[in-house]
């Protein structure tokens, strides 16, 4: 019976699907073999002959079982602000991620398309939310009783030292200066070491040495159908 034919190509039964690692070829109207990762369809199947697969050429790849006529091109070499975390092989695309001190301003399916340097909070401002792989640092003004005297993408606002006798009062960008007697560090509730939520106002009004958003960049992305992958149906 046709339903029991084990070898591709074969005509599927009504309502049935082609098996795993097979696809339905619209021209042949048959279930045919897909090509394995690292290969592509060199010759499509007919009613009497199965798909002929061939290896991907250098700098091209297929990651899934497929029947694409050409392998996909690996992405371009990683830029100077990136590190290559996965090399281009016949079975996988190159993956570039942002190097330390940078975050991904424009991601792609795997890895990053555009990296941007992490914002540095200037003196008087501390890190409210640390940067991640995909988000920039958020700065906040140092609250009364705290300061930051650095330009840094990691330093938070620290509490002023508490003096027995104050020589120079502390402000948002400078620690208090004490006279002769030994200072003690404040552990007051206002002295916050961990990142806190910031108000919209403080985010909008904070001065920053760098732009707070990445420059607007346009990219031409493919709009055609995605390459055939697993799970195609039969007749």
């Amino acid at each position: 019976l046709p339903a029991q034919v084990a070898f591709t190509p074969y005509a599927p039964e009504p309502g049935s699907t082609c098996r795993l690692r097979e696809y339905y070829d619209q021209t042949a109207q048959m279930c045919c073999s897909k090509c394995s990762p690292g290969q592509h369809a060199k010759v499509f199947c007919t009613k009497t002959s199965d798909t002929v697969c061939d290896s991907c050429e250098d700098s091209t790849y297929t990651q899934l079982w497929n029947w694409v006529p050409e392998c996909l091109s690996c992405g371009s070499r990683c830029s100077s602000d990136q590190v290559e975390t996965q090399a281009c092989t016949r079975e996988q695309n190159r993956i570039c991620t942002c190097r330390p001190g940078w975050y991904c301003a424009l991601s792609k399916q795997e890895g990053c398309r555009l990296c941007a340097p992490l914002r540095k909070c200037r003196p008087g401002f501390g890190v409210a939310r640390p940067g991640t792989e995909t988000s920039d640092v958020v700065c906040k003004p140092c609250a009364p009783g705290t300061f930051s005297n650095t330009t840094s993408s990691t330093d938070i606002c620290r509490p002023h030292q508490i003096c027995n006798v104050v020589a120079i009062p502390g402000n948002a960008s400078m620690d208090a200066v004490c006279t002769s007697t030994s200072p003690t560090r404040s552990m007051a509730p206002g002295a916050v070491h961990l990142p806190q939520p910031v108000s919209t106002r403080s985010q909008h009004t904070q001065p920053t040495p760098e732009p707070s958003t990445a420059p607007s960049t346009s990219f031409l992305l493919p709009m055609g159908p995605s390459p055939p992958a697993e799970g195609s149906t039969g007749d």
């Epitope: 046709p2 005509a11 021209t27 048959m30 009613k47 007749d235």
Partner: antibody
Framework: QVQLVQSGSELKKPGASVKVSCKAS????????MSWVRQAPGQGLEWMGW????????TYAQGFTGRFVFSLDTSVSTAYLQISSLKAEDTAVYFC????????WGQGTLVTVSS | DIVLTQSPDSLAVSLGERATINCRAS??????????MHWYQQKPGQPPKLLIY???NLESGVPDRFSGSGSRTDFTLTISSLQAEDVAVYYC?????????FGGGTKVEIK
Amino acid sequence: QVQLVQSGSELKKPGASVKVSCKASGYTFTTFGMSWVRQAPGQGLEWMGWINTYSGVPTYAQGFTGRFVFSLDTSVSTAYLQISSLKAEDTAVYFCARRSNFAYWGQGTLVTVSS
Amino acid sequence: DIVLTQSPDSLAVSLGERATINCRASESVDSSGNSFMHWYQQKPGQPPKLLIYRASNLESGVPDRFSGSGSRTDFTLTISSLQAEDVAVYYCQQSNEDPWTFGGGTKVEIK
């Protein structure tokens, strides 16, 4: 279940154009091609060609090139047949039929060309 | 193109009797162990309805009084016991190669 639902009857004047739609449901639209078949009044069935619903590439049978255009809108699982510069001899019922190794058919669309 | 020749053009059969329709292809319609010949029934104002696919497979929901046989170039549709609702035109169709082609049709009537 597989269903192909076509647009309603059309009455057109010679020289006009018509666009017939065929909406598919009950299966993945881009898996199977779509054929178009013509049946003139009191006549048999004539295959016009087909369109690959994955690639969008049409194939036209002899006698159906030029004035006949197959197209798709995969977002709504619909195939289209457009006929331009209509002639009286284009009067027929037009069927869409799923291109598997046998066909599932739409209900047909009557196109009448008359002055 | 593969030419399909149906015979007879019309057929009058008594209720309950056997009706046989033949379809001959100008070249083989067999590939990969299958015969890509199908049979359809068409009633006035309706689309063709699939009865038999790939020469001998009965489509789901079709009464088992319909059967198909044959291979390569010669095929037969048989209605074992004609019923009133079987009055229609019957077409063979091949999908082994493009262009799809159809037989000229056989009109089945009650005698």
